[in-house]
């Protein structure tokens, strides 16, 4: 079964994939797709190198590491939930049925939000009730602020504070909710 | 407009050689994997060969170590090299291109060449 | 090898009427969730067709008639109602694992 890596979201992501060149130089093409090997390919190709240079790529994803020694690990940037599930790191050997292939699992965990202080402090002292994004299940649960009953006008309010903080881009990229009663 | 043309078919002698060529055009051959199908007289299909994007080669058993498959990116071609051929080889073989990012199922074909082993 | 075994091997089918083959493999095709089973019908002196991948996704520019269904080791296509440019053979193709492998075939012919 597919070794699994974990990351945040918002931070970077490394899923590795390592080869050894027959010679310095004398490179193998490898591809990253997205989605488990298939037969053949490399699925949903995301990096594409070949025996010279890294010859396809989409944004966010790139080689961090020495590709020409043969480290083709993959780095994705500022990732999402949406980058969860199987990746596919083929290294196309020549040969007959030379192909190595590496199905690995990234799991995307909510960030861990520490609101800012003036924030935290504005929260405690307006709602004595709990703020909270959800995640996978009960244990991704993590609590941001304290809330009392809230009317609809506080939580457009609540909202409009934090449009352009830090705070609400993790609220967004995690699911947040939030929890009242 | 996909489109595949197969050509070098013939009749060869047992134990002869035969390279069959497929010509593509209406895409990016580069980086598609591409096989080899062929069709004996009122039979089934037998998969017989493919080369992936990267250039790596799959052969069933019954054919190992007789048949080798190339590409040639630069002049959008596939090529079959064929030895020690059988009586058994005999067949229709299709130029199959492989789907995107898998490779393992054929989404065009061409309409064929016609390999005959025969003394 | 993974064999398929299509069954019937000829079907006799009526105009209008609708047709299901089955194609069984000799172990599962599932792999991460998806059933790596394609179904391809061919005429008389033309190149297979491409109709189903994965068990059941109907390749563009194919008539809404024909499905496909199943998962694991069994699979089925259907042709809601047989038009006179379905009488062919189909045959089904595992791309689970090399080498690559198709059923006998499925001839369907008009009753």
């Known amino acids: 079964s597919e070794v699994e890596y974990r990351a945040e979201v918002g931070q970077n992501a490394y899923l590795p994939c390592f080869y050894t060149p027959a010679a310095p130089g004398n490179l193998v093409p490898v591809c990253w797709g997205k989605g488990a090997c298939p037969v053949f390919e490399c699925g949903n190709v995301v990096l594409r190198t070949d025996e010279r240079d890294v010859n396809y790529w989409t944004s966010r994803y790139w080689l961090n590491g020495d590709f020409r020694k043969g480290d083709v690990s993959l780095t994705i940037e500022n990732v999402t939930l949406a980058d969860s599930g199987i990746y596919c790191c083929r290294i196309q050997i020549p040969g007959i049925m030379n192909d190595e292939k590496f199905n690995l699992k990234l799991v995307i965990k909510p960030a861990k939000v520490t609101p800012a202080p003036t924030l935290q402090r504005d929260f405690t002292a307006a709602f004595p009730r709990m703020l909270t994004t959800r995640g996978h299940g009960p244990a991704e649960t993590q609590t941001l602020g304290s809330l009392p009953d809230i009317n609809l006008t506080q939580i457009s309010t609540l909202a409009n504070e934090l449009r352009d903080s830090r705070l609400a881009n993790d609220l967004r990229d995690s699911g947040a909710t939030i929890r009242i009663g | 407009e996909v489109q595949l043309v197969e050509s070098g078919g013939g009749l060869v002698q047992p134990g002869g050689s035969l390279r069959l060529s497929c010509a593509a055009s209406?895409?990016?051959?580069?980086?598609?994997?591409m096989s080899w199908v062929r069709q004996a007289p009122g039979k089934g299909l037998e998969w017989v060969a493919a080369?992936?994007?990267?250039?790596?080669?799959y052969f069933p058993d019954s054919v190992k170590g007789r048949f080798t498959i190339s590409r040639d990116n630069a002049k959008n071609s596939c090529y079959l090299q064929m030895n020690s051929l059988r009586a058994e080889d005999t067949a229709v073989y299709y130029c199959?291109?492989?789907?995107?990012?898998?490779?393992?199922?054929?989404?065009?074909w061409g309409q064929g060449t016609l390999v005959t082993v025969s003394s | 090898d993974i064999v398929l075994t299509q069954s019937p091997a000829t079907l006799s089918v009526s105009p209008g009427e609708r047709a299901t083959l089955s194609c069984r493999a000799s172990?599962?095709?599932?792999?991460?969730?998806?059933?790596?089973m394609q179904w391809y019908q061919q005429k008389p002196g033309q190149a297979p067709r491409l109709l189903i991948y994965?068990?059941?996704n109907v390749e563009s520019g194919v008539p809404a008639r024909f499905s496909g269904s199943g998962s694991g080791t069994e699979f089925t296509l259907t042709i809601s109602s047989l038009q006179s440019e379905d009488f062919a053979v189909y045959y089904c193709?595992?791309?689970?694992?090399?080498?690559?492998?198709f059923g006998g075939g499925t001839k369907v012919e008009i009753k």
């Open positions: 209406g895409f990016t051959f580069s980086r598609y994997a």
């Open positions: 172990e599962s095709v599932e792999y991460y969730g998806t059933s790596l």
């Open positions: 193709q595992q791309s689970m694992k090399v080498p690559l492998t």
């Open positions: 080369i992936s994007s990267g250039g790596s080669l």
């Open positions: 994965a068990a059941s």
């Open positions: 199959a291109r492989g789907r995107e990012a898998d490779g393992g199922y054929f989404d065009y």
